[in-house]
């Protein structure tokens, strides 16, 4: 039987949702006149880069489009894209497929995303509403690393 | 349908601990998407929010009372209960339980208890 | 002091249209975050009245509408009946606290 991805809406503490802007993830407060994404998640086949102690390797996509989460460097900083790709492509690849992976690790009852990639880089949202989704070291104060992943229907 | 009722006693002593439960029917505390909140009435005024649990069991509390608050859930008996410590006679009100699910009531409450009066005095 | 702030008292004949409002911030109203209002009768629990801004839940009368720009939000009630005499709040989210916001209150007299 073929796997599927398991479907989760998600938030932060701030109760900002995840939202797509075009080709581009933002971060917006939990509204009825927002629809938030519904986010993919499957886990990697391929062994290669597992690191049990940082979690377990997934790919990230959102549901209903063929994107998928992805980090590669612009001028010299790891950065957090959005890419054309179906979700289920990913996944049945033999091999890891590096700037989609992060590592999912569970911290109380939120959620933490790493990227392979880029180790110490975490998904991220900022404290003001309307900015990207984005990648950063600096876990804590000004920056919202942890998120709940809500079951949705 | 869900329904919330409130319970504990009706007179504290000042500096002692203020316990409530609330008892939530026709429906599982633990069920996805739903967040659990206190909020009181002081006699004569206004609405002011304690604090909140939700489904994972993460608590939010109201930053003036956070110090004095614990919110927490028993999921074997459906419950949600409040502990408010070294209580004073500005404690007094009526405290109410509340209800609301996040991407259906968008951060409001929805269902309500009936409230109970709690009155702080020696 | 409440960190959203509505009008103590207004008041109208029956037949007449009032408004309500309410006037939040940059981190509550005008961050997008949601208004709720909620109808107060004397004696019992709040009951929600409007959520999501401009929607009612079934079973509210279509004589209440609620609407929300900018930092601010209002309830509006036409064709006033004895029935509505009642405590009216707003609620909303606030991110800088994180937590929920409530409005001091209005009390709605029919004249």
């Known amino acids: 039987r073929e796997a599927a991805p398991k479907s989760y809406a998600i938030r932060d503490s701030r109760q900002m949702v995840w939202v797509l802007s075009g080709n581009s993830l933002i971060a917006a407060p939990l509204s009825r006149s927002i629809k938030p994404v519904t986010l993919h998640l499957i886990a990697c086949r391929d062994t290669e880069f597992s690191d049990k102690e940082k979690g377990n390797m997934v790919y990230l996509g959102i549901k209903g489009k063929d994107l998928c989460l992805f980090c590669a460097e612009i001028q010299g900083k790891p950065t957090l894209q959005l890419k054309e790709k179906n979700i289920m492509d990913l996944y049945v690849e033999k091999k890891a497929q590096k700037p989609f992976l992060f590592f999912h690790n569970k911290e109380g009852s939120t959620s933490v995303f790493q990227s392979v990639s880029y180790p110490g880089w975490f998904i991220a949202t900022s404290t003001t509403s309307g900015q990207p989704i984005f990648l950063t070291k600096e876990r804590g104060i000004t920056n919202n690393t942890n998120f709940y992943l809500d079951s949705v229907e | 349908e869900l329904q919330l009722q409130e319970s504990g006693p009706g007179l504290v002593k000042p500096s002692e601990t203020l316990s409530l439960t609330c008892t939530v029917s026709?429906?599982?505390?633990?069920?996805?998407?739903?967040?659990w909140g206190w909020i009181r009435q002081p006699p004569g005024k206004g609405l002011e929010w304690i604090g909140s649990?939700?489904?994972?069991?993460?608590?939010y509390y109201n930053p003036s009372l956070k110090s004095r608050v614990t919110i927490s859930v028993d999921t074997s008996k459906n419950q949600f209960s409040l502990k408010l410590s070294s209580v004073t006679a500005a404690d007094t009100a009526v405290y109410y339980c509340?209800?609301?699910?996040?991407?259906?009531?968008?951060?409001?409450?929805?269902?309500w208890g009936q409230g109970t009066l709690v009155t702080v005095s020696s | 002091e409440s960190v959203l702030t509505q009008p103590p008292s207004v008041s109208g004949a029956p037949g007449q249209r009032v408004t309500i409002s309410c006037t939040g911030s940059?981190?509550?109203?005008?961050?997008?975050?949601?208004v709720h209002w909620y109808q107060q009768l004397p004696g019992t629990a709040p009951k929600l009245l409007i959520y999501?801004?401009?929607n009612r839940p079934s079973g509210v009368p279509d004589r209440f509408s609620g609407s929300k720009s900018g930092t601010s939000a209002s309830l509006a009630i036409t064709g006033l009946q004895a029935e509505d005499e009642a405590d009216y709040y707003c609620q909303s989210y606030d991110y800088s606290l994180s937590g929920y916001v409530f409005g001091g209150g209005t009390k709605l007299t029919v004249l």
């Open positions: 509340a209800s609301g699910k996040y991407y259906e009531t968008y951060l409001g409450f929805d269902v």
């Open positions: 999501g801004n401009d």
């Open positions: 649990i939700d489904y994972t069991g993460s608590t």
């Open positions: 026709g429906g599982s505390i633990t069920a996805s998407n739903y967040y």
């Open positions: 940059s981190s509550n109203i005008g961050a997008h975050y949601d």
